[in-house]
Interface confidence: low
């Protein structure tokens, strides 16, 4: 849609005569009729397909036409069209003499024509006026013309409709070529997408208006770049949402189990060495002369059972003394008067001579210990099973029977239901005491994030007249791209064709 504008500037008819050569009485009271039509190689009579306009009497014989656009819009003359400007045209300008006040064609004598000019050619849409001058034997007409687009129409053919807006459907003004120019803070094909706060994380943050940064589930912080750890996570951090990666020295699902009791609580007394041995458990290795779980008790020197091979210990002021059983001697009854010939090894132990037969050593079979293999080993006395596992003696070995949720030789490993990556589409898995839970990313749902929830707004084919449908990812709405000749949000309205003008 646009307007062909014709600005009449000067008409010269010095002799004041009609086209027939007859003079006007008293002078030629001159008005103009203009016909605009499609391009014709030879301009011929017929309908003014692009429009027609007439002027009132503008002067007598020779006169300049003043620019009167402010006072009623008579000059420049306006020839509006509501179609795509084809780039070519034909123009007929007739100067007529008006003997009276009635300027209708049927009210004029047929020889009232003063002059007639016809031009044709190419004309691009633009602000610049084209100046032209046409001279006949008796007259001269100087005029200029141009084609401009109507409000809200743009492009080389005035065919691009663009209406600035600032609402839910877009936030833009129009560029000279009809392309949208987004208002500050908006982006996207139709400027419907707000530009989030600078630095707002592309995946984890979003916004509904400019300079905002709203966090998706599992994220926090001004720029939505900090993950939210698992609810109840005590001594841990996360790199993805709902994680609880334990700080050094902490364990368990919520990192609330102390794996470094030694450092955090220093339980061992009297210079003992502390060793962590599991969640909230530790072992103190006492210095000589101390005992107790935390080495808090001083002991007599006999408390450390220094006498071997069944010797009995006697406390003395300056230490202790071992009373050895028959067949043994030495400070700790460590030497035997027996030899392998006396078969001193019980329970199938093998005897090995030492010190040229003056001594011996027993090599015990599994499950037996002691100098003479006289003691049966209870492999469960040290309670090796973690996390409440039950210790079972099984012949030469031991075995841990684990509680549900634990595994490993000593039940030391927590079974993770998440180990097999059950959550689809990048869902985050959380171990719970009685199973697992998936936290789904935007656009997915279901127990395992297996259901895609975003819809294809174009699936219902909402666009008419062979228009192309586009889905707007951010809003799950559709946008129709109309072919030439159609407008409307669904391309449902045809652009009107020009009316026919009788000449």
């Amino acid at each position: 849609s646009g307007v062909f504008q014709l600005q009449l500037q000067e008409f010269i008819n010095e002799r004041g005569v009609l086209a027939s050569g007859r003079p006007c009485e008293p002078g030629c009271r001159t008005f103009f009729r203009v016909c605009l039509k499609h391009f014709q190689a030879v301009v011929s009579p017929g309908p003014c397909t692009f429009g027609t306009v007439s002027t009132p009497v503008l002067g007598t014989n020779s006169f300049a036409v003043r620019d009167d656009s402010s006072g009623g819009g008579r000059n420049p003359l306006q020839l509006p069209f509501n179609f795509t400007w084809p780039g070519t045209f034909s123009l007929i300008i007739e100067a007529w003499h008006a003997p009276g006040d009635d300027l209708r064609p049927e009210a004029l004598p047929p020889d009232a024509l003063i002059s007639k000019i016809a031009i044709q050619g190419s004309l691009a849409v633009g602000q610049n006026w084209l100046l032209d001058e046409q001279t006949s034997t008796l007259t001269r007409l100087r005029y200029s013309y141009r084609v401009i687009c109507s409000d809200n129409y743009y492009g080389d053919n005035c065919s691009r409709l663009c209406k600035k807006r600032n609402d839910h459907f877009g936030h833009y003004v129009c560029q000279p070529d009809g392309n949208l120019s987004c208002l500050p803070g908006w982006t996207g094909e139709y400027c419907q997408q707000p530009i989030c706060l600078s630095g707002c994380h592309e995946q984890n943050g979003y916004c509904s208006k400019p300079a905002e940064c709203l966090c998706r589930p599992g994220w926090q912080g001004r720029l939505c770049n900090e993950c939210i750890p698992h609810n109840g996570c005590r001594h841990g951090t996360c790199s993805t949402p709902w994680q609880c990666t334990c700080d050094e020295g902490w364990g368990g699902l919520f990192c609330d189990q102390d794996l470094n009791y030694c450092t955090h609580h220093s339980p061992c007394k009297n210079g003992a060495t502390c060793s962590n041995s599991g969640q909230r458990s530790y072992t103190c290795t006492c210095r000589p002369g101390y005992t107790g779980v935390d080495c808090e008790l001083e002991l007599s020197e006999c408390d450390s059972n220094p006498c071997r091979n069944g010797g009995s210990c006697k406390d003395q002021e300056d230490g202790y003394h071992c009373l050895c059983p028959p067949g043994y001697y030495g400070l700790h009854c460590e030497h035997s008067t027996l030899s392998c010939a006396d078969s001193p090894c019980f329970n199938g132990g093998s005897c090995r001579e030492r010190n040229q037969g003056a001594n011996y050593a027993c090599e015990c079979p599994p499950n037996f210990t002691g100098s003479n293999c006289e003691k049966k080993v209870d492999r469960c006395t040290s309670n090796p099973c973690a996390n409440g596992g039950q210790c079972l003696n099984r012949g030469p070995s031991r075995m841990c029977r684990c509680r549900p949720g634990f595994t490993g030789t000593y039940c030391e490993l927590h079974v993770s239901d998440c180990a097999r990556n059950p959550c689809a589409h990048g869902g985050t898995c959380h171990d719970l005491e009685n199973g697992l839970m998936c936290t789904c990313p935007a656009g997915f749902s279901g127990r395992r994030c297996e259901v895609r929830t975003s819809i294809d707004a174009c699936a219902s084919s909402p666009c008419f007249n062979r228009a192309t449908c586009y889905t707007d990812l951010s809003t799950d709405t559709f946008v129709c791209n109309c072919p030439y000749g159609f407008v409307g949000s669904r391309c449902e309205f045809p652009v009107g064709l020009p009316p026919s003008f009788p000449w």
């Epitope: 070529d177 982006t187 996207g188 094909e189 997408q193 689809a424």
Partner: antibody, heavy 124, light 111 residues
Framework: QVQLVQSGAEVKKPGASVKVSCKAS????????ITWVRQAPGQGPEWMGW????????NYAQKLQDRVTVTTDTSTSTAYMELRSLRSDDTAVYYC?????????????????WGQGTMVTVSS | QSVLTQPPSASGTPGQRVTISCSGS????????VYWYQQLPGTAPKLLIY???QRPSGVPDRFSGSESGTSASLAISGLRSEDEADYYC????????????FGGGTRLTVL
């Protein structure tokens, strides 16, 4: 019509740098992002990086980000890709391509218009 | 080694229907749209399908795309000799701070 015209073929020695240009015409240059993709002989395309001529945002492939820089000169509607410390396995056809959708802040939309490609050969 | 997996070759006779598959993961096809490019010998790739199943203007409706879960496929019906080309799938991948990934390509031969 809308087109991207790239600079001519280059032969470089290992360790050198190359700068490929991509001149846009037929559309408003500052409305669209430009992506750079390379394709070694007989291989599939490999994404290198992207720049928005609209707001200057950039994004690079992690494997190349220490060696590649993409820039634009809006006064001449031209995009540039510079690759430094060239190696023999950088021998490839280098393409520039335009985002399908204008004025997007990140490069998650495909590329609809491609340049004709620039052959870069790295050989001692 | 390409992040998206395509069969290296496919073939069919004129008029036939052929399908090319593209397999990815939750960080690419599972979360983002799939795009298909056609590359004729010695030319730049051409956008064939965008946003899983949309055709740019000028692409015949013989070409169609679909996506399910972490896989996608391109179907060409009424095969013609001019369809002989390399076909690549592509998608945005949000791992490693985000990047585009392509398939290794499928060479389509029209017998």
């Amino acid at each position: 019509q809308v087109q991207l015209v790239q600079s001519g073929a280059e032969v470089k020695k290992p360790g050198a740098s190359v700068k490929v240009s991509c001149k846009a015409s037929g559309y408003t240059f500052t409305n669209y992002g430009i992506t750079w993709v390379r394709q070694a002989p007989g291989q599939g395309p490999e994404w290198m990086g992207w720049i928005s001529a609209y707001n200057g945002n950039t994004n690079y492939a992690q494997k190349l980000q220490d060696r590649v820089t993409v820039t634009t000169d809006t006064s001449t509607s031209t995009a540039y890709m510079e690759l430094r410390s060239l190696r023999s396995d950088d021998t490839a056809v280098y393409y520039c391509a335009r985002d399908r959708v204008p004025r997007i802040p990140v490069t998650t939309e495909a590329f609809d218009i491609w340049g004709q490609g620039t052959m870069v050969t790295v050989s001692s | 080694q390409s992040v998206l997996t395509q069969p290296p070759s496919a073939s069919g006779t004129p008029g036939q229907r052929v399908t090319i598959s593209c397999s990815g993961s939750s960080s690419n096809i599972g979360s983002y749209f799939v795009y298909w490019y056609q590359q004729l010998p010695g030319t730049a790739p051409k956008l064939l399908i965008y946003r899983n199943n949309q055709r740019p203007s000028g692409v015949p409706d013989r070409f169609s795309g679909s996506e399910s879960g972490t896989s996608a496929s391109l179907a060409i019906s009424g095969l013609r000799s001019e369809d002989e080309a390399d076909y690549y799938c592509a998608a945005w991948d949000d791992s490693l701070s985000g990047h585009w990934v392509f398939g290794g390509g499928t060479r389509l031969t029209v017998l």
